[in-house]
């Protein structure tokens, strides 16, 4: 059962796993949610009746029954983790805590103009978990405007104390606001020889990399595969760090793989969701339950629905035993990973999918697409929406992309002459325009947010957000696309598609079926040569064939230029402008979305 509200002056008795320090009960709840075993917590607020050494303590708790006895205690605030809830969860915490000093290892001290600048510095520093900033009113002259970057083993403060005229806060890496590089490559036959901060068992290097990503101290990892010569180290995932933030030594070793934490790209790549099945693999751990199940998929469902289950092993039924049902072993451990991984015993293992809700919805795999052909199939581009105007009559106006459950990203030039958001209708999950009838459900538009530097498409800033009146329930036919990571600025995308219901030639009409075209990106230098009369800025991105023939056209505006990278689709561009349509040596010009990620997040995350 999902319980989101906090219980004031209430303490849960017993069940303690560990104690951490958090600046608020709300953040304590987030820490509990991300902890592999925590189901309940008790936080102690500052209070004259409490011993100051207990202020800001966050006691993480577990219980077989998923609840614990309640005791009245002033200044105690208790609650449940969001593990039991189905809604999307985020570790992003933008709060600034006034007059609190969050203790940790102060590894960097510098002058900053503001707390915001200090927070940005922390967000863009690979080691930083949180910071404390001494304001200009701080009594000690030499400490004024000092920004202290801090880290700890757990990612949370080792203590929190009251201190006048300072402010503290957390890194915004988990808010997708870091400019740090996002290195997705996994290096085969490589061992990083730096210090280990932890080790866990993992079935493959991808799971190892995801574990590294949500481990607060891990910057890179080495994984020993099941063919690794030393038996005791097989399936071992070593979580590593270094002072520089990069591996100091790379050793060539067969059957080992190494890679980096994906913390700077975690909003656009799954890091919690281990959805694969591992055949002929047994995961060992503390047994929670043994139940009969028809298949390994059914076993995974049972594990996902059991809030304490972290992973499972399924043993298929022998011949006609037990109505063809196998045994499903639901398991857990102290850290969420198997204590040992065995091969060759016929089991099929995997992880709970409960943690998938901690990943951005946009990272969910969508169904395989049809290669070739210009007409799309249903569910192929589930982020694509058709934006209709009702003036003078109802019609397709522009394309757009779902980027959040209340947000559509589109082009600013679509709204020339649109006096009110009320006259707009957003239709999602549509393949054919002819599906849209008078009684077809749509999303009303609450607000149109146009970039305040927008003047005309050709001069850039051709970007707008639509805030919907109601939220989108994600399904296979309507779900968000990931924004590109700022750390991905140097990625060369090779699998890019433009989609829309726009014209197929300059003098044409809106198409009934959603069209798609695979189009190569063109460098800005090359693009500038083709548009000598315009300034192609770094905030624009171009795509097209030299010989022409495939391009976006009238009616495609605002729609996505979607590029697939590492199995995840990213919204790389917004269809903006071009000279004619599909003309030779006239590429289409798109708004370069990565350059507007901060603007998008500022507008969509505004309270």
């Amino acid at each position: 059962e999902c319980v989101t509200q906090l219980l004031k002056d209430t303490c849960f008795e017993g069940g303690d796993i560990t104690t951490v320090f958090t600046p608020s009960a709300k953040y304590c709840q987030v820490v509990c949610t991300y902890h592999p075993r925590c189901l309940l917590f008790t936080f102690t607020a500052e209070s004259p009746s409490e011993d100051p050494t207990r202020w800001f303590t966050c006691v993480l708790k577990d219980s077989v029954t998923e609840t614990l006895p309640r005791v009245n205690r002033t200044a105690a605030i208790s609650g449940y983790s969001f593990k039991q809830c189905s809604h999307q969860i985020s570790a992003c915490n933008k709060d600034i805590y006034v007059d609190l000093d969050m203790k940790g290892i102060n590894y960097n001290s510098s002058v900053a103009k503001s707390a915001q600048e200090c927070q940005e510095r922390c967000t863009d520093d690979v080691h930083c978990h949180f910071f404390t900033y001494a304001t200009r009113q701080f009594p000690s002259l030499e400490h004024r405007n000092i920004c202290l970057l801090k880290h700890t083993q757990t990612g949370t403060p080792t203590r929190i104390t009251k201190l006048d005229k300072v402010v503290s806060g957390f890194s915004l890496k988990s808010c997708a606001l870091s400019n740090l590089a996002c290195i997705r490559d996994i290096f085969p036959n490589t061992v990083f020889a730096d210090s280990n901060i932890d080790s866990v068992m993992a079935p493959d290097a991808f799971v190892c990399g995801r574990i590294c990503t949500h481990h607060p101290g891990c910057l890179f990892f080495t994984f020993f595969s099941q063919e690794w010569p030393k038996e005791s180290q097989r399936n071992l995932c070593l979580l590593k760090t270094s002072e520089s933030g990069l591996p100091s030594t790379r050793i060539k070793k067969s059957k080992a793989l190494s890679g980096f934490s994906l913390q700077s790209c975690r909003h656009s790549i799954p890091v919690f969701c281990h959805s694969s099945f591992y055949h002929d693999t047994d995961f060992l751990g503390e047994e929670l339950d043994i139940v009969a199940a028809k298949s390994h998929e059914a076993c995974q469902k049972l594990c996902t629905n059991a809030v304490r289950c972290q992973f499972f092993t399924y043993t298929p039924a022998q011949a006609s035993c037990n109505e063809g049902k196998g045994k499903c072993y639901l398991k857990l451990s102290s850290n969420g990973s198997p204590t040992k991984i065995l091969h060759g015993r016929g089991g099929i293992s995997g992880y709970t999918l409960r943690l998938c809700k901690m990943d951005n919805e946009c990272t969910t795999k969508i169904k395989p697409r049809i290669v070739g052909g210009t007409a799309s199939v249903r569910g192929e581009w589930p982020w694509q929406v058709t934006l209709h105007t009702t003036s003078p009559t109802q019609r397709h106006l522009c394309g757009g992309s779902i980027i959040g459950n209340q947000w559509i990203l589109t082009a600013a030039h679509c709204f020339y002459g649109v006096e009110s958001p009320k006259i707009l209708r957003v239709y999602s999950g549509i393949l054919n325009q002819s599906e849209i009838k008078e009684d077809t459900s749509f999303f009303g538009v609450q607000e149109i947010i146009i970039h305040d530097q927008y003047k005309m498409a050709e001069s850039g800033y051709d970007i707008a957000l639509l805030k919907l009146e109601t939220t989108v329930n994600y399904t296979d036919s309507q779900r968000p696309i990931c924004l590109p990571s700022k750390g991905d600025r140097n990625v060369i995308y090779t699998d890019c598609w433009v989609t829309g219901w726009g014209y197929r030639k300059l003098r044409d009409k809106i198409q009934n079926t959603l069209q798609k075209a695979k189009i190569p990106l063109v460098t800005n230098e090359e693009c500038q040569k083709r548009y000598r009369g315009h300034k192609i800025t770094h905030k624009m991105i171009c795509a097209g064939y030299r010989e022409g023939g495939k391009d976006a056209c009238k009616g495609d505006s605002g729609g996505p230029l979607s590029c697939k990278h590492n199995e995840v689709w990213h919204l790389v561009g917004i269809t903006s402008w071009g000279e004619g349509c599909a003309q030779r040596e006239r590429p289409g010009v798109y708004t370069n979305v990565v350059e507007y990620v901060d603007w998008i997040l500022e507008k969509t995350q505004a309270v």
Partner: antibody
């Protein structure tokens, strides 16, 4: 079922103003544009303008922009058209019509306005 | 403004005849054309929308065609009750405009 009921005939002197009403029922009034169309005796149809009741957005034909004012009262689901500085050529039947999904699908019965001294 | 030119302005035909009325737009209006029927003393009624879609309850002897600038309303077999004035109108862009009407009579 959708119905548009217009106010009764009006006889006005030149220079006066007239305010016509159009009461809508059977649908969500705020979600559809309401248009006004003029038909002079023995003539074709002439578009005056439209209003979106949910936002009070309006559009007018240039010819009527200075003299026609479209308003809507969402509490009573009624659209209004006020025509000022009346002259003899304003003598006509005035229709309110709902812009449905793709076209003007429902029409009021019309209001006859006669301008005569 | 987009001018809609309707022809003929009047026509007389016999019951059972195939009747065609045309409407020409001064510029491309894609398929944003509607046809209306207006009987004496009554308000106009929608027959065809989107150039070729028959409105609910309209007999299938009425059909519309065309796109861009040239549009046609066809009555495949004229009936006595079809005596009326027929109007075309464009809703592609403001201001909305109508043809001058075609008065249809029975011979």
């Amino acid at each position: 079922q959708v119905q548009l009921v217009q106010s009764g005939s009006e006889l006005k002197k030149p220079g006066a103003s007239v305010k016509l009403s159009c009461k809508a029922s059977g649908y969500t009034f705020t979600r559809y544009w309401m248009h006004w169309v003029k038909q002079a005796p023995g003539q074709g149809l002439e578009w005056i303008g439209n209003i979106y009741p949910d936002s009070d957005s309006t559009n007018y034909d240039e010819k009527f922009r200075t003299r026609a004012t479209l308003t809507a009262d969402t509490s009573t689901s009624t659209a209004y058209m006020e025509l000022s500085s009346l002259r003899s050529e304003d003598t006509a039947v005035y229709y309110c019509t709902r812009m449905g999904f793709y076209a003007m699908d429902y029409w009021g019965q019309g209001t006859t306005v006669t301008v005569s001294s | 403004d987009i001018v809609m030119t309707q022809s003929p302005s009047s026509l007389s035909a016999s019951v059972g005849d195939r009747v065609t009325i045309t409407c020409k737009a001064s510029e491309n209006v894609v398929t944003y054309v509607s046809w209306f029927q207006q009987k004496p003393g009554q308000a106009p009624k929608l027959l065809i929308y989107g150039a070729s879609n028959r409105y609910t309850g309209v007999p299938d002897r009425f059909s519309g065609s065309g796109s861009g600038t040239d549009f046609t309303l066809t009555i495949s077999s004229l009936q006595a009750e079809d005596v009326a004035t027929y109007h075309c109108g464009q809703s592609y862009s403001y201001p909305l405009t109508f043809g001058q009407g075609t008065k249809l009579e029975i011979k």
